[in-house]
Interface confidence: medium
């Protein structure tokens, strides 16, 4: 009679996380007498997965009734698979011995790979705001996926971006992987309502990619434009000068009026007008008593926006 | 048969405080017979972490069932890790002996480092107030973090500050560290509504820094400006003189009127007008009966603000 062979027909098996994995094994003979065990890995550090005769293995069930006479099928099913279960599984035949049973023959091994979904991508933007025409960086991260093959794309308002760099870690074999990508985005004045999107495609997602988003409103500062004009007034001894502060973002704005370089009034913008592109406008006016001045007056509208250095615009008021 | 080896596969393991640490250890043989123990540190002062056979180690669980026949995996998991658990852990095999078991072989050791979050930064300002144009110091403290690498930044109203000095203690190795930083801030008249922010970034914070704040309103004193003017009155024998006290902070203010150097009336400011910059204005008036005076009267408005030395402004009232 030919010597017993241990047949593991599949070289590899791929299972989605949470599902059960069936690992097949068959013997070609009933002799010699002795138990079958399943191990993950080989050598001294191998991990016992199932022992036919003793032990407690609640996640493992046998496909056949191992105790049936003439049974040669020693396939097992492992429930609730996680990425940590990945590895090579060996079906091993032992021969009864004293004091211990002796390993007789091992199967060739079946590599179990676990398909695990990537986590929802998290997109984060720059720590400080930047102004239009400048470039800012956004990062996208996702973890816990397997296998390693994955595709990441960046979009700005639906338009695909090309200036980005992506890493998948670790470089070697692992039970699961992480992806990290950094995209460089050039800001424009109209970007207050813009969005960047990080899109991840993976075999586990059945063609339905995961997306993470970030709003450019958190990353942009649009500095205001100033215009100072004199408005007509009925009263002869009064002049009304307005300062139109236009197209700024975010809201925070403090305006100071100076008469010949001396502070006349300071106010904080509150009731703003929002433009369609998400920027704001605001207007302030100053009533000047012309009787109080002999000579011409230089009126300056000075604006501090979002904690930045102040900008100003001046207007020469002629005293006739 | 080869002599037993004790395998500790990881040279180092890093764990976040509060999590569990898995320390892996495997034997290459079942012989000699004797228990396995885990220690922290080496030499005479080493600390017993786990004894396979006896003792009470509620934080330690074994990864495998140590009593299973042929078990060679003596990995352990230590729950609820704190910075005090940092150190090098050794898996040690003993050989049964009399009267005591004898140490047979030790693993190479696994260094456990603990990542611990810094405490919420506490920002404290100067003990006494200072006036605009002066420099005040703010301190920021945070404790209990590990590893030692940490970044601290100061901001005033969103603008990064550069004049500060930071120390991380202790200088040598420790289970956890503290940071102490002192920033020097130049006060301006508009700083009543200003804030200083101490921002701490650490590997444990996943890019979401901790912030501590202090209001400059606690540190600043803006001294008042005084203006004394005479208001027109219908009654011929009465003069109304007002003292306009402007742009002061904090509230505490006592005003005294003097007529030719003699105290006429003292009052404490109560109903104040708050300016947009957070400073206060207040006005006091004095009705002077001109009939009671033969000669011109010098009226003095004397103001004691926030416990400081009094300032005054005088006005000569002409008695026609």
């Amino acid at each position: 009679e030919d010597e017993l062979q241990v047949i593991q027909p599949e070289k590899s098996v791929s299972v989605a996380a949470g599902e059960s994995a069936t690992l097949r094994c068959a013997m070609t003979s009933l002799i010699p007498v002795g138990p079958i065990m399943w191990f993950r890995g080989a050598g001294a550090g191998r991990e016992l997965i199932y022992n036919q005769k003793e032990g407690h293995f609640p996640r493992v069930t046998t496909v056949s009734e191992l105790t049936k006479r003439n049974n040669l099928d020693f396939s097992i099913s492992i429930s609730n698979i996680t990425p940590a279960d990945a590895g090579t599984y060996y079906c091993v035949k032992f021969r009864k011995g004293s004091p211990d049973d002796v390993e007789f023959k091992s199967g060739a091994g079946t590599e179990l790979s676990v398909r695990a979904k990537p986590s929802a991508p998290v997109v984060s933007g720059p720590a400080v705001r930047a102004t239009p025409e400048h470039t800012v960086s956004f990062t996208c991260e996702s973890h816990g996926f397997s296998p390693r093959d994955i595709t990441l794309k960046w979009f700005k308002n639906g338009n695909e971006l090309s200036d980005f760099q992506t890493n998948v870690d670790p470089a070697g074999d692992s039970v699961s992987y992480s992806i990290h990508s950094t995209a460089r985005v050039v800001l424009t004045r109209g970007d207050v309502h813009s969005q960047v999107i990080c899109e991840i495609a993976h075999i586990t997602l059945q063609g339905d990619p995961l997306r993470g988003t970030a709003n450019l409103s958190e990353a942009i500062r649009v500095p205001p434009t100033l215009e100072v004009t004199q408005q007509p007034m009925r009263a002869e001894n009064q002049a009304n000068v307005t300062c139109q502060v236009s197209n700024f973002y975010p809201r925070g704005l403090q305006l100071t009026w100076l008469e010949n370089g001396n502070v006349s009034r300071t106010e904080t913008a509150s009731t703003l007008i929002e433009n369609k592109d998400g920027t704001y406008n605001w207007m302030s006016w100053l009533l000047v008593n012309t009787c109080a001045h002999r000579d011409d007056v230089v009126l300056t509208c000075q604006v501090e926006h979002d904690g930045q250095q102040a900008v100003s615009k001046s207007y020469a008021l002629e005293i006739s | 048969e080869d002599e037993l080896q004790v395998i500790q596969p990881e040279k180092s393991v890093s764990v976040a405080a509060g999590e569990s640490a898995t320390l892996r250890c495997a034997m290459t043989s079942l012989i000699p017979v004797g228990p396995i123990m885990w220690f922290r540190g080496a030499g005479a002062g080493r600390e017993l972490i786990y004894n396979q056979k006896e003792g009470h180690f509620p934080r330690v669980t074994t990864v495998s069932e140590l009593t299973k026949r042929n078990n060679l995996d003596f990995s352990i998991s230590i729950s609820n890790i704190t910075p005090a658990d940092a150190g090098t852990y050794y898996c040690v095999k003993f050989r049964k002996g009399s009267p005591d078991d004898v140490e047979f072989k030790s693993g190479a050791g696994t260094e456990l480092s603990v990542r611990a979050k810094p405490s919420a930064p506490v920002v404290s300002g100067p003990a006494v107030r200072a006036t605009p144009e002066h420099t005040v110091s703010f301190t920021c403290e945070s404790h209990g973090f590990s590893p030692r690498d940490i970044t601290l930044k100061w901001f005033k109203n969103g603008n990064e500050l550069s004049d500060f000095q930071t120390n991380v203690d202790p200088a040598g190795d420790s289970v956890s560290y503290s940071i102490h930083s002192t920033a020097r801030v130049v006060l301006t008249r508009g700083d009543v509504h200003s804030q200083v922010i101490c921002e701490i970034a650490h590997i444990t914070l996943q890019g979401d820094p901790l912030r501590g704040t202090a209001n400059l309103s606690e540190a600043i004193r803006v001294p008042p400006t005084l203006e004394v003017t005479q208001q027109p009155m219908r009654a011929e024998n009465q003069a109304n003189v007002t003292c306009q006290v402007s742009n002061f902070y904090p509230r505490g203010l006592q005003l005294t009127w003097l007529e030719n150097g003699n105290v006429s009336r003292t009052e404490t400011a109560s109903t104040l007008i708050e300016n947009k910059d957070g400073t206060y204005n207040w006005m006091s008036w004095l009705l002077v009966n001109t009939c009671a005076h033969r000669d011109d009267v010098v009226l003095t408005c004397q103001v004691e603000h926030d416990g400081q030395q009094a300032v005054s402004k005088s006005y000569a009232l002409e008695i026609s």
Partner: antibody, heavy 113, light 108 residues
């Protein structure tokens, strides 16, 4: 739940032998050392010895060496302590304990002629 | 063998007071191997403190343990009526294992 249940009180004559049992539940006796401790009336605790039920290896305190035998039956999850050549000063409560953490309720042995 | 000497033999205190119980070893004991037990009349000893300073499950926080080398201490910050009992220190650093002779904590 871990439980150690000891056999009942014994009265013995000087020179006799007593064998006390300690049946455990909630764990496998092979997993831990089993200790025995003596407490004479109004006195403190005294360690007698221990067994490793996995391979029946024992350790004894010099004071009890030669008179005490500790055994274990892994099939019934029970440990035993046998003390021979009893004398009046052996009158005491005897405790079994699992790995120093869990104790039996104690067995009173009275040696009296 | 390592001899453990406990002091005082008897400690008479009132509820609310602080109690300090000492255990001195004739040679050095690693802190991992020093345990304390509480025993009340007619009951088996209960593990109270393990590895010098760790409270066993369910033991109130008013108890604490400290020490190293040859000198170990059990402290009760503010005595409660149920704390009055006998306390034993125990070493299992080397054979033969030994107990201290006990400290009886009684109500004054």
């Amino acid at each position: 739940e871990v439980q150690l249940v000891q056999s009942g009180a014994e009265v013995k004559k000087p020179g006799a032998t007593v064998k006390i049992s300690c049946k455990v539940s909630g764990f496998n006796i092979k997993d831990y050392y089993m200790h025995w401790v003596q407490q004479a009336p109004g006195k403190g605790l005294e360690w007698i010895g221990r067994i490793d039920p996995e391979d029946a290896e024992t350790k004894y305190a010099p004071k009890f060496q030669g008179r005490v035998t500790i055994t274990a039956d892994t099939s019934t999850n029970t440990a035993y302590m046998e003390l021979s050549s009893l004398r009046s000063e052996d009158t005491a409560v005897y405790y079994c304990d699992r790995g120093l953490a869990y104790w039996g309720q104690g067995t009173l042995v009275t040696v009296s002629s | 063998e390592i001899v453990l000497t406990q002091s005082p033999a008897t400690l008479s205190l009132s509820p609310g007071e602080r109690a300090t119980l000492s255990c001195s070893a004739s040679s050095s004991v690693s802190s991992s191997y020093l345990y304390w037990y509480q025993q009340k009349p007619g009951q088996a000893p209960k593990l109270w403190i393990y590895s010098t300073s760790n409270l066993a499950s369910g033991i109130p926080a008013r108890f604490s343990g400290s020490g190293s080398g040859t000198d170990f201490t059990l402290t009760i910050s503010s005595l409660e009526p149920e704390d009055f009992a006998v306390y034993y220190c125990h070493q299992w650093s080397s054979y033969p294992y030994t107990f201290g002779q006990g400290t009886k904590l009684e109500i004054k």
